[in-house]
């Protein structure tokens, strides 16, 4: 059976296509090619007589067609208007004709696309942004890339207009991109230059660093304030509610106890119109910023229940400190049988009961520091055992 085949089927605009003919019958008189799905004299492209080896253009001839003795038709410098069906009429010597129809599709060589945006400076959590991939072309697939990745599944990302438009609903600061669009057809592909979003946001709640609260007299106080913001925030400092200066950093040399107080950082974004503040308390004191690790001792570590008593002592060389006791992560005293004395240095349990068995430790602290001892284990039993005195923790 007579057939035609397009080589290639998908043709780039400006290139050439060959309509190949297969299974030509014997005893041929001539050929005639037509534009369309049927023989139509008004749309004849070219005729060819085998006997004279002559061809003649028909009404639909553009000057770009060449017919070959084997009936194949070459069309050069194709345009998108050439897309469609082509019918070959084979005239046999006996005037019993055969026909075959083929087709091809012409696609443009795609240009480098560009991205247009309806809002290049959106406000976080408020604005939506629509990106459109230009130009609009027929028979084209539009693809989008964010950070060189294909689009993630997200309810905030919407494709429309045949995927030519990408809409970001309620932008966030993480939506800066870069964004790229790619256009594809069966013969070419091209990607745009990247586009980034300048998302306006903040300021977030400021952070004052360093985190220290306690300072010794004579030290330098240097505080820095930072709030995530675009454009960058404008900062100002207040001490005890009184404006000090409009800088991101506050520096006070040679502080005294009079510099103790509440330090407020105020961050402002002039574009979003938002303000945020953070307050930090600074205490200037002679107290030791580092408390040494205390030692814990027990009058005995194994006692008889309901009979014996025990004294636990927490010792430290630091001054101006406080002591507190813990048993099984609970603060003591926890019963009337437990007594603290000598400024909480000694914990007495009298009498000792079964539930008092377990791990004890003490913690020494001042307003700017604390430290805790290693734990000590108290064993309680109810049979007469020799008593051990003054054992240090093991």
């Amino acid at each position: 059976q007579l057939t035609t085949e397009s080589m290639p089927f998908n043709v780039a605009e400006g290139k050439e296509v060959l309509l190949l003919v297969h299974n030509l019958p014997q005893q041929l008189f001539g050929y005639s090619w037509y534009k369309g799905e049927r023989v139509d004299g008004n749309r004849q492209i070219v005729g060819y007589a085998i006997g004279t080896q002559q061809a003649t253009p028909g009404p639909a001839n553009s000057g770009r067609e060449t017919i070959y003795p084997n009936a194949s038709l070459l069309i050069q410098n194709v345009t998108q208007n050439d897309t469609g069906f082509y019918t070959l009429q084979v005239i046999k010597s006996d005037l019993v004709n055969e026909e075959a129809t083929g087709q091809f599709h012409v696609y443009p060589e795609l240009p480098k696309p560009s991205i247009s945006s309806n809002n290049s400076n959106p406000v976080e959590d408020k604005d939506a942004v629509a990106f459109t991939c230009e130009p609009e072309t027929q028979d084209t697939t539009y693809l989008w890339w964010i950070n060189n990745q294909s689009l993630p599944v997200s309810p905030r990302l919407q494709l429309s207009n045949g995927n030519r438009t990408l809409t970001l609903l309620s932008v966030t600061r993480n939506d800066t991109g870069p964004y790229e669009c790619e256009i594809q057809n069966p013969v070419s592909a091209n990607r745009s230059d990247p586009v980034t979003l300048n998302v306006t946001y903040g300021p977030d709640t400021p952070t004052i660093s360093p985190s220290d609260t306690y300072y010794r007299p004579g030290a330098n106080l240097s505080l820095s304030c930072y709030a995530a913001s675009n454009p960058p925030a404008q900062y100002s400092w207040l001490i005890n509610g009184t404006f000090q200066q409009s800088t991101q950093e506050l520096f006070i040399p040679n502080i005294t106890v009079n510099n103790s107080g509440s330090y407020t950082c105020h961050a402002n974004n002039s574009v979003t119109g938002c303000n945020r503040t953070t307050v930090k308390t600074i205490i200037v004191t002679e107290l030791s910023p580092v408390v040494a690790k205390p030692q814990i001792k027990a009058s005995k570590t194994t006692v008889t229940g309901d009979k014996d008593s025990v004294n636990l002592t927490c010792s430290t060389n630091d001054t101006g400190i406080s002591i507190r006791w813990f048993f099984k992560n609970q603060s003591l005293p926890s019963s009337e049988r437990m007594k603290l004395s000598q400024g909480n240095t000694t914990l007495s349990i009298n009498p000792v009961k079964r539930e008092d068995a377990g791990t004890y430790w003490c913690e020494v602290f001042n307003p700017i520091s604390k430290n805790q001892s290693d734990p000590i284990m108290l064993n309680v039993n109810y049979n007469a055992l020799p008593q051990e005195n003054g054992l240090s923790p093991g």
Partner: antibody, heavy 127, light 110 residues
Framework: EVQLLESGGGLVQPGGSLRLSCAAS????????MSWVRQAPGKGLEWVSG????????YYADSVKGRFTISRDNSKNTLYLQMNSLRAEDTAVYYC????????????????????WGQGTLVTVSS | QSVLTQPPSAPGTPGQRVTISCSGS????????VTWYQQLPGTAPKLLIY???HRPSGVPDRFSGSKSGTSASLAISGLRSEDEADYYC???????????FGGGTKLTVL
């Protein structure tokens, strides 16, 4: 079945007019060139006129030029021959015929032929 | 007087080979293809040979055509009684810008 059927013949006085029709069926009429051929009683064939598939070209024998007009209506699959100023020598059986070949070479008329014929219609010009 | 010249008659006997000639000029046969038609008594003409020598479907291969210069010929081999008919040659004439027929040849199978 490919068929051509002429009609419109009859007796007409000299100087009179007649319009012949040829109804085509069984093929795509609009793709083919068509002709009128006549045959006087007991005489040979005489080509009268031809028309291209799209009516773009029309041809006439010298003997009928200026008196006969060939036309076609592709939407009705019909070929016509308008005959005016009829003479006695126009008396004949008039056949319509189809040219089987599309234009294959620059000189389209080179392969002119007629493969399908009607049964003919008799035109008698007499007073 | 026809533009193309054919012998008025051509006799033959069954089984014989008969040739009918057609003579023209440079403006017709010398420049264009020749066609042959058969007209059986009381019927419309039938295409026998086109483009000098090509036979349409249904035409027996006993019929053949040829052309040389300004003349053409139709050969019928293995003549049969049903071949008895009038035979016409035809060609386009560039000078007249018209199609022309020969005067016809009456083939008689004796």
């Amino acid at each position: 079945e490919v068929q051509l059927l002429e009609s419109g013949g009859g007796l007409v006085q000299p100087g009179g007019s007649l319009r012949l029709s040829c109804a085509a069926s069984g093929f795509t009429f609009s793709n083919y060139d068509m002709s009128w051929v006549r045959q006087a009683p007991g005489k040979g064939l005489e080509w009268v006129s031809g028309i291209s598939h799209s009516s773009g070209s029309k041809y006439y024998a010298d003997s009928v030029k200026g008196r006969f007009t060939i036309s076609r209506d592709n939407s009705k699959n019909t070929l016509y021959l308008q005959m005016n100023s009829l003479r006695a020598e126009d008396t004949a059986v008039y056949y319509c015929a189809r040219d089987p070949l599309p234009c294959l070479i620059p000189k389209c008329s080179y392969y002119y032929a007629m493969d399908v014929w009607g049964q003919g219609t008799l035109v008698t010009v007499s007073s | 007087q026809s533009v193309l010249t054919q012998p008025p008659s051509a006799p033959g006997t069954p089984g014989q080979r008969v040739t009918i000639s057609c003579s023209g000029s440079s403006s017709n046969i010398g420049s264009n293809a020749v066609t042959w038609y058969q007209q059986l008594p009381g019927t419309a003409p039938k295409l026998l040979i086109y483009a000098d020598s090509h036979r349409p479907s249904g035409v027996p291969d006993r019929f053949s055509g040829s052309k040389s210069g300004t003349s053409a010929s139709l050969a019928i081999s293995g003549l049969r009684s049903e071949d008895e008919a009038d035979y016409y040659c035809g060609s386009w004439d560039d000078s007249l810008n018209a199609y022309v027929f020969g005067g016809g040849t009456k083939l008689t199978v004796l």
